[in-house]
């Protein structure tokens, strides 16, 4: 009779993580008598996956009934596959012996590869805010996927970005892989409502890519522009001066009025108005009693925005003549809108 052969018909098997892998094995003869064992690996360090005779193999089931006398199908199923299960599996026939069974013949092996989905991409921006016209970096990371082939794209408000670098790690063979990408984005004044999106496409996602997003509102700082104007006389000897703080973001802003360099009033932007682009406007009023001053008054509106160095705009109030409407513009950037009277 022809000597027993162990046939593993599948050179390789590809299974999605979480699914069941079927590893096929048949013997060509019932002789010699002895059990089949499945191993991962072929050397002395090989791992026992299934032993027909004894042992504990909670994830393994046999395809056919191995207790039947004429059974020659020794295929197994391994449940709940993870990337850590990847490797070469060998079906090995043992010959009954005393005191121990002796390895008789091995199959050629089946390479089990595991398809694993990438984790949801995590996008992170710079630690500190930056102002328009500056270039900032965003990173995107996704882990745990297999096979290695993967596509990553960056978008800003739906427009694809081209200035980015991507690495898939490790370079060689692995159970699973990670992707890391860094994109450069130039900020504009209109970016408060903008989003940066990292999109990952992988064979396991069946054409439905995963996306990670970052809101530029967490990255951008738009400095305010200041304008100080003198309003017509409200009452005898009283002049109303306003400081308009325009187009700033984020809202955190503190305004200080100075009269001839001396602090007159400090307030924090609270009731602001929001512009369409997401920036804020705010206005502060100062009522100045002209009769209390002999000389001309220098009024300064000083704004500290989001912890940055203060910007200011001054206005000279003439005391000698009857006050007329005067104005003075200032350029600086910020956002907010709050109307208050200062008495």
């Amino acid at each position: 009779e022809e000597e027993l052969q162990v046939i593993q018909p599948d050179k390789s098997v590809l299974v999605a993580a979480g699914e069941t892998a079927t590893l096929r094995c048949t013997a060509t003869s019932l002789i010699p008598v002895g059990p089949i064992q499945w191993f991962r690996g072929a050397g002395p360090g090989r791992e026992l996956i299934y032993n027909q005779k004894e042992g504990h193999f909670p994830r393994v089931t046999t395809v056919s009934d191995l207790t039947k006398r004429n059974n020659m199908d020794f295929s197994i199923r391994i449940g709940n596959i993870t990337p850590a299960d990847a490797g070469t599996y060998y079906c090995v026939k043992f010959r009954k012996g005393s005191p121990d069974d002796v390895e008789f013949k091995s199959g050629a092996g089946t390479e089990l590869s595991v398809r694993a989905k990438p984790s949801a991409p995590v996008v992170s921006g710079p630690a500190a805010r930056a102002t328009p016209q500056h270039t900032v970096s965003f990173t995107c990371e996704s882990h745990g996927f297999s096979p290695r082939d993967i596509t990553l794209k960056w978008f800003k408000n739906g427009n694809e970005l081209s200035d980015f670098q991507t690495n898939v790690d490790p370079v060689g063979e692995s159970v699973s892989y990670s992707i890391h990408s860094t994109a450069k984005v130039v900020l504009t004044r209109e970016d408060v409502h903008s989003q940066v999106i990292c999109e990952v496409a992988h064979v396991t996602l069946q054409g439905d890519p995963l996306r990670g997003t970052a809101n530029l509102s967490e990255t951008i700082r738009v400095p305010p522009t200041l304008e100080v104007t003198q309003q017509p006389v409200r009452a005898e000897n009283q002049v109303n001066v306003t400081c308009q703080v325009r187009k700033f973001y984020p809202q955190r802003l503190q305004l200080t009025w100075l009269e001839n360099g001396n602090v007159s009033r400090t307030e924090t932007a609270s009731t602001v108005t929001e512009n369409k682009d997401g920036t804020y406007n705010w206005m502060s009023w100062l009522l100045v009693n002209v009769s209390a001053h002999r000389d001309d008054v220098k009024l300064t509106c000083q704004v500290e925005h989001d912890g940055q160095p203060a910007v200011s705009k001054s206005h000279d109030l003439k005391v000698s003549a009857h006050p007329k409407e005067q104005g003075s513009n200032t350029a600086a950037e910020n956002t907010g809108s709050n109307e208050r009277n200062i008495y």
Partner: antibody, heavy 118, light 114 residues
Amino acid sequence: EVMLVESGGGLVKPGGSLKLTCAASGFIFSNYAMSWVRQTPEKRLEWVATFSSGGSYTYYQDSVKGRFTVSRDNAKNTLYLQMSSLRSEDTAMYYCARSGWDGWFAYWGQGTLVTVSA
Amino acid sequence: DIVMTQSPSSLAMSVGQKVTMSCKSSQSLLNSSNQKNYLAWYQQKPGQSPKLLVYFASTRESGVPDRFIGSGSGTDFTLTISSVQAEDLANYFCQQHCSTLPWTFGGGTKLEIK
């Protein structure tokens, strides 16, 4: 969590014997090949012996063949190394290690020191 | 027996630097049937037992930081630490894990942090 705890080391005279024990937990012991690896005082690592999974196959470094015997008790989750005819060159830290599935050593115990000296 | 040779025997690097160490085998560790290189890398910190970093030359063990990168094929292999950290102070050993016994280790590379 995989745990391997060695014991049984000590000071022994040349020609003497010693039995090392490795108590394993945190995995299905019988499914894995188990090995002994030693580290010499010069910090060189040497594979000593392996007991296979799924069959009573044992493998030895040439220098210890006939003097050392590796055995396992799957019911007790324990690996043993019986050492006899000990030589000064056997002085080392002996580690119990669980093999990966193709010959590397995935987990190591904390080691037990064997000193062979007159 | 397959002889494993590591170089350098020691090196000192500053935190954040890229570290590379070499391991050469006296015969090829590439298995032609599955195209895998049977080489592992271990880290042994002072007073501790060795810890597996990489097997099959480049497959990083679960839980190992991705700054550890194994590469190479045939007889020439490299372990790279892309940005060395203070906690990476250790001895690093390579091992061939072919089916042909005995399994053998390199003499080690001692990494010191400046």
